[in-house]
Interface confidence: low
């Protein structure tokens, strides 16, 4: 008979996994002993390997929940083409039975005693509830049993008494204005506020409690300005030393507004707190050196190599600059006098080029002469080689940027009969005369 064939057998669950398909014979499915099969969908899964006993199942629940019972477990002979130990055919179940006891004794119900007396009403005025209780001890339950029903019951009760209303304060009223406009007078300024026992008022019959606490409260006024005190100048201090070691400087005298210090918003002292005088050291000031602009880069070379031009071989080149203008022990120029960089030499290298777009129009030349013209150009621009933009020259010193250096020989297809530069000229129109602006104003 045809079977469903699977690619895996899961030992832990005994399930077939990875359906390959149906309609094949057991013999064909089991050409691979790692496969498994089912005779029908959802049926028993049998692995294709040689038969052996499955693991024992877990024990089934105990047959009774209290006192002694028994429970079963099983294992199955699973596999194909052979027998399990004991000459048992695949599919056969083997059972084990053992005694079990979830709980030694079985629960027994108890019985209630009679109801006790009603407790007093839960309130002393208006309506409330009262309660009575009974005990589960007639007889007491055994082995975790219980009594059926409730251990207490409640009913409504009416005291036939009207409840009193107790007094409660309404919110505080606003603070009254302060008794004075500033601090420091003979009487400390105070403010007052009041409240009423009206939220609600206490009842007369039956008598309610009055509101607790005071109907008035007082506090010291805060935030009042003290009386202002005007400030007064102290004496001039000593003249400060000349603050410079060369050239002209400025010395200073100071005085403080502290005779007295202005207080409580009083006005500050009128006039200046400092006065200055010129002082002369008669010593010329040092002049720091300043770097000239960098010189031209030296040719791009590599030590021990005659030429590296037109090759993907990085070299080095340097440029220098001069520190000028240092006088009277001024600072030397900061930084390096020599700049070194890595380079590829494309000096005189024949490179493929491409014509640039037109440049912007240049200035009119000559500016003050006859018939000035302006020009624009298209240049044969070299296409630079795609050499690596960084190199590692010395082990452990990391990557260094490499720059192209030199004037290559770009080669473009001829344009308007030219190989390197095509120029277009135009006359400048409506040209004004050149006049000295100083003379114009006279």
């Amino acid at each position: 008979d045809p079977v469903l064939c699977f690619t895996q057998y899961e030992e832990s669950s005994g399930k077939c996994k990875g359906l390959l398909g149906g309609g094949v014979s057991v013999e064909d499915c089991c050409l691979n002993t790692a496969f498994a099969y089912q005779k029908r969908s959802g049926g028993l899964c049998q692995p294709c390997r040689s038969p052996r006993w499955s693991l024992w199942s877990t024990w089934a629940p105990c047959s009774v929940t209290c006192s002694e019972g028994s429970q079963l477990r099983y294992r199955r002979c699973v596999g194909w083409n052979g027998q399990c130990s004991g000459k048992v055919a695949p599919g056969t179940l083997e059972w084990q039975l053992q005694a079990c006891e979830d709980q030694q004794c079985c629960p027994e119900m108890g019985g209630w005693s009679g109801w006790g007396p009603w407790e007093p009403c839960s309130v002393t005025c208006s309506k409330g509830t009262r309660t009575r209780r009974r005990a589960c001890n007639h007889p007491a339950p055994k082995c975790g049993g219980h009594c059926p029903g409730q251990a207490q019951e409640s009913e409504a009760c009416d005291t036939q008494q009207v409840c009193p209303t107790h007094g409660a304060w309404a919110t505080w009223g606003p603070w009254t204005p302060c008794s004075a406009s500033c601090h420091g007078g003979p009487h400390e300024p105070k403010e007052t506020r009041s409240r009423k026992c009206s939220a609600p008022e206490p009842s007369q019959k039956p008598p309610g409690k009055p509101c607790p606490g005071l109907a008035y409260e007082q506090r010291r006024c805060t935030g009042l300005p003290p009386c202002p005190v005007a400030g007064g100048w102290g004496p001039w201090g000593p003249v400060s030393p000349c603050p410079v070691t060369c050239g002209l400087g400025q010395t200073m005298e100071q005085r403080t507004c502290n005779h007295p210090v202005p207080q409580h918003g009083g006005p500050f002292c009128a006039g200046d707190a400092t006065r200055t005088h010129i002082c002369n050291t008669a010593v010329p000031c040092p002049v720091d050196g300043e770097w000239d602009s960098w010189g031209e880069w030296s040719p791009c070379i590599r030590r021990n190599m005659k030429s590296i031009s037109c090759q993907e071989i990085p070299g080095q080149q340097s440029r220098g600059r001069t520190c000028r203008g240092r006088k009277f022990d001024g600072h030397r120029c900061a930084g390096q006098q020599q700049d070194i960089r890595h380079c590829y030499s494309i000096q005189h290298c024949p490179l493929k080029g491409s014509w640039s777009e037109w440049s912007t129009w240049g200035l009119c030349m000559p500016p003050c002469g006859p018939n000035p013209t302006r020009a624009r150009q298209r240049l044969c621009t070299p296409l630079l080689p795609k050499y690596p933009p960084t190199v590692s020259m010395v082990e452990g010193q990391g990557e260094k940027n490499v720059t192209f250096w030199g004037r290559p020989l770009p080669r473009c297809e001829e344009l308007q009969g030219q190989k390197l530069v095509v120029e277009e000229k135009r006359p400048c129109l409506h040209v004004p005369a050149c006049k000295d602006p100083e003379e114009e104003e006279l």
């Epitope: 993907e312 080689p385 795609k386």
Partner: nanobody
Amino acid sequence: EVQLVESGGGSVQAGGSLRLSCAASISIRSFNYMAWFRQAPGKEREGVAASYAGGVSTYYTDSVKGRFTISQDNAQKRVYLQMNSLKPEDTAVYYCAATQDVIWRTGPLESDEYRYWGQGTQVTVSS
């Protein structure tokens, strides 16, 4: 006519190593650049590694840096590609290429820069 012949391909488990060899019919000193390219099924040819002037400069695509090494033996007229820590995504046909040109337009790992090509050798990496 210049000929390049690759060898050393084959099947290997992930994590394993292979060494590809490319034999040239002329002295490889005459080539400025020699390189290895690869092409996986349904993908474009990709530059893997290149060597300039017998190893003065070497270039690698990012995905193989630290795993592949290009080297050459001038006496044997051979260029090699040592491939370590192979991955399933390294599966492809590997080609050897060479050129005498020196000024690049697109870069040393671009196939249109190379004049001479081998027939290729298959490398299969299984997981």
